[in-house]
């Protein structure tokens, strides 16, 4: 039997193609630096195929190596704005379970208004990823300026 | 039958491995903010496997979720140059069919000379991606400084 | 037979899922602009599945199109620091064999302290990738700030 046919007969989930792309929902209360995400076709071009959202944070459902990517743009921002405020930093990390807590990716907005990066990292079922924005600038909610996603790459 | 053998017997296209990496050909006339791309082994390390170029714009041939990535560097640029001009912004979006027109990814060069980002997005057969560079600074045509690509990730 | 089962019976290498994510080990001696990388689970979240390290440089073991990505952050850096020094530039390229030597990706730190980018490029078995950091600023060795990786995408 041709692989292409076999591929159609199996649910995609069994091929390990977990993937998610999220858009910003809101920021947390003052002492909570986390960004809260949302996803789904009703919201536009965001989606979750495999991973899930748990109170606005992304939870992994399949062990493997993932490509994690993020872009965050600060609202009403120019290089002048950025320089007028204390350094704003974005960190993506595993925030639960606590035993696996670690920072995976960190960037500062120096005199810029956007950060964007990506990396490969092993993640395990149940890992929850948090994106912490420290600083006092509000991020843009435009879906083409601020987004966060993961793509399963291999076991 | 071993999967590795089956894989060799099937055309790659049937596995859905559409991928393209393009280099800058030229900018548009004054009122046209689009960048015009080119690709192919004769040009260096750029290529199109599945997607096609339509008058310098990238047209998708297979439905699916794609990783879209781009880097654009401004020519003869320093942070001083960048700050002396009106904000230069790069936007990647679906420009046709008009019914699906949307901005997918947007970044500004604040006091920097390079932007680079990537995102996951659903694309459909026939979608044409345009990359609009607004501002009065010319982009570099160096193939290691300015490039644009897509990679099919899953159905 | 189900593909999911077939997948488990074959070594992953036969599926062409070569992937590596590296962390910075050290910089070279004064006249050597190369960054020297390290990887492996004992070091944290870095790994090599397929590619190998040759004296701190990444050597490819399988022909194909790869997604190459990198992030480099300068140590003890602010936008003031960055602007006070001669331009610092990062270039990723094939450095051996000499006949295939080429720059694949290049970025400058203008008034920023981090660069991050990614691109698709064809690589061949035996290609060694070098990451050259020119300038007089030391890169951060924090594993969430400086990393370099490749992912096999298709033949």
């Amino acid at each position: 039997q041709r692989f292409a046919q076999a591929q159609q007969q199996l649910p995609l989930e069994s091929l390990g193609w977990d993937v998610a792309e999220l858009q910003l929902n809101h920021t947390g209360p003052q002492q909570d630096p986390r960004l809260y995400w949302q996803g789904g076709p009703a919201l536009g071009r965001s989606f979750l195929h495999g991973p899930e959202l748990d109170k606005g944070q992304l939870r992994i459902h399949r062990d493997g190596i993932y490509m994690v990517h993020i872009q965050v743009t600060l609202a009403i921002c120019s290089s002048t704005t950025a320089s007028r405020h204390h350094p704003t930093t974005l960190a993506v990390g595993i925030c639960s379970p606590a035993s696996r807590s670690i920072s995976l990716l960190r960037l500062s907005f120096h005199q810029g208004c956007t950060i964007a990066s990506q990396r490969l990292t092993p993640l395990a079922r149940g890992d929850t990823l948090c994106t912490n924005l420290t600083g006092t600038l509000l991020p843009s909610r435009n879906t083409d300026e601020t987004f966060f996603g993961v793509q399963w790459v291999r076991p | 039958q071993r999967f590795a053998q089956a894989q060799q017997q099937l055309p790659l296209e049937s596995l859905g491995w559409d991928v393209a990496e393009l280099q800058l050909n030229h900018t548009g006339p004054q009122q046209d903010p689009r960048l015009y791309w080119q690709g192919g082994p004769a040009l260096g390390r750029s290529f199109l496997h599945g997607p096609e170029l339509d008058k310098g714009q990238l047209r998708i041939h297979r439905d699916g979720i794609y990783m879209v990535h781009i880097q654009v560097t401004l020519a003869i640029c320093s942070s001083t140059t960048a700050s002396r001009h009106h904000p230069t912004t790069l936007a990647v979006g679906i420009c046709s069919p008009a019914s699906r027109s949307i901005s997918l990814l947007r970044l500004s060069f604040h006091q920097g000379c390079t932007i680079a980002s990537q995102r996951l997005t659903p694309l459909a057969r026939g979608d044409t991606l345009c990359t609009n560079l607004t501002g009065t600074l010319l982009p570099s045509r160096n193939t290691d400084e300015t490039f644009f690509g897509v990679q099919w990730v899953r159905p | 037979q189900r593909f999911a089962q077939a997948q488990q019976q074959l070594p992953l290498e036969s599926l062409g899922w070569d992937v590596a994510e590296l962390q910075l080990n050290h910089t070279g001696p004064q006249q050597d602009p190369r960054l020297y990388w390290q990887g492996g689970p004992a070091l944290g979240r870095s790994f090599l599945h397929g590619p190998e390290l040759d004296k701190g440089q990444l050597r490819i073991h399988r022909d194909g199109i790869y997604m190459v990505h990198i992030q480099v952050t300068l140590a003890i850096c602010s936008s003031t620091t960055a602007s006070r020094h001669h331009p610092t530039t990062l270039a990723v390229g094939i450095c051996s064999p000499a006949s295939r030597s080429i720059s694949l990706l290049r970025l400058s730190f203008h008034q920023g302290c981090t660069i991050a980018s990614q691109r698709l490029t064809p690589l061949a078995r035996g290609d060694t990738l070098c990451t050259n950091l020119t300038g007089t600023l030391l890169p951060s060795r924090n594993t969430d700030e400086t990393f370099f990786g490749v992912q096999w995408v298709r033949p």
Epitope: L24, A75, S83, R84, H86, S140, R141, T143 | - | -
Partner: antibody, heavy 120, light 111 residues
């Protein structure tokens, strides 16, 4: 709790300077910005300027030549000085805290106001 | 500078009824996925008090009878049901760019 307490003279002679001190409590000037706004019957509420948490200032272009805002983080004090006062500067002058997000540029807590009269 | 035009200049509303105040900006105050418009209440002898930020977000401690809506250039503050303590002057303020500007105010009186 958050408070902004203003102190300064209510009467200024024409062409002289107005100086107001805004002493804050319940929050840190290293985290929050402070705006200055005035209110007069003729012109309503007018934004004058702001001092950001970093100490950098932005002024309304209409007042930039005669306005100066500074601060002392350790004393939790913000200093407002406007030169060359004339009769159309008669107003109530307020200091007000910017909310946590610096680019929100609203005012969530206000001082009690300093009523300023210009007269010889 | 962005000019904010409030209407009406004054209105009288009975207890328990709805009060609607409008604010129109001379250009859009929307950017970055937010509407940078805020609403304040001011009573005689007091400084203004923030009620609503980013067009529709209720400031902490403000009663739920206050609500804000709108986007682009047209914004509305609603009070329902109006209570006796709501007699005051209401101002809109934008923060899309510097300088920040305020509307001229709407005086709400009780019938």
């Amino acid at each position: 709790q958050v408070q902004l307490q203003q102190s300064g003279p209510g009467l200024v002679q024409p062409s002289q300077s107005l100086s107001i001190t805004c002493t804050v409590s319940g929050f840190s000037l290293t985290t929050y910005a402070v705006h200055w706004v005035r209110q007069s019957p003729g012109k309503g509420l007018e934004w004058l300027g702001v001092i950001w948490s970093t100490g950098i200032t932005d002024y309304n272009a209409a007042f930039i030549s005669r306005l100066s805002i500074s601060k002392d983080n350790s004393k939790s004090q913000v200093f407002f000085k406007m030169n060359s006062l004339q009769s159309d500067d008669i107003a109530i002058y307020y200091c007000a805290r910017n909310p946590y997000y610096g680019n929100l540029n609203a005012m969530d807590y206000w001082g009690q106001g300093t009523s300023v009269t210009v007269s010889s | 500078d962005i000019v904010l035009t409030q209407s009406p200049a004054s209105l009288a509303v009975s207890l328990g009824q709805r009060a609607t105040i409008s604010c129109r900006a001379s250009k859009s105050v929307d950017t970055s996925g937010y509407s940078f418009m805020h609403w304040y209440q001011q009573k005689p002898g007091q400084p203004p008090k923030l009620l609503i930020y980013l067009a529709s977000n209720l400031e902490s401690g403000v009663p739920a009878r206050f609500s804000g809506s709108g986007s682009g250039t047209d914004f509305t503050l609603n009070i329902h049901p109006v209570e006796e303590e709501d007699a005051a002057t209401y101002y809109c303020q934008h923060s899309r760019e510097l300088p920040l500007t305020f509307g001229a105010g709407t005086k709400l009186e009780l019938k």
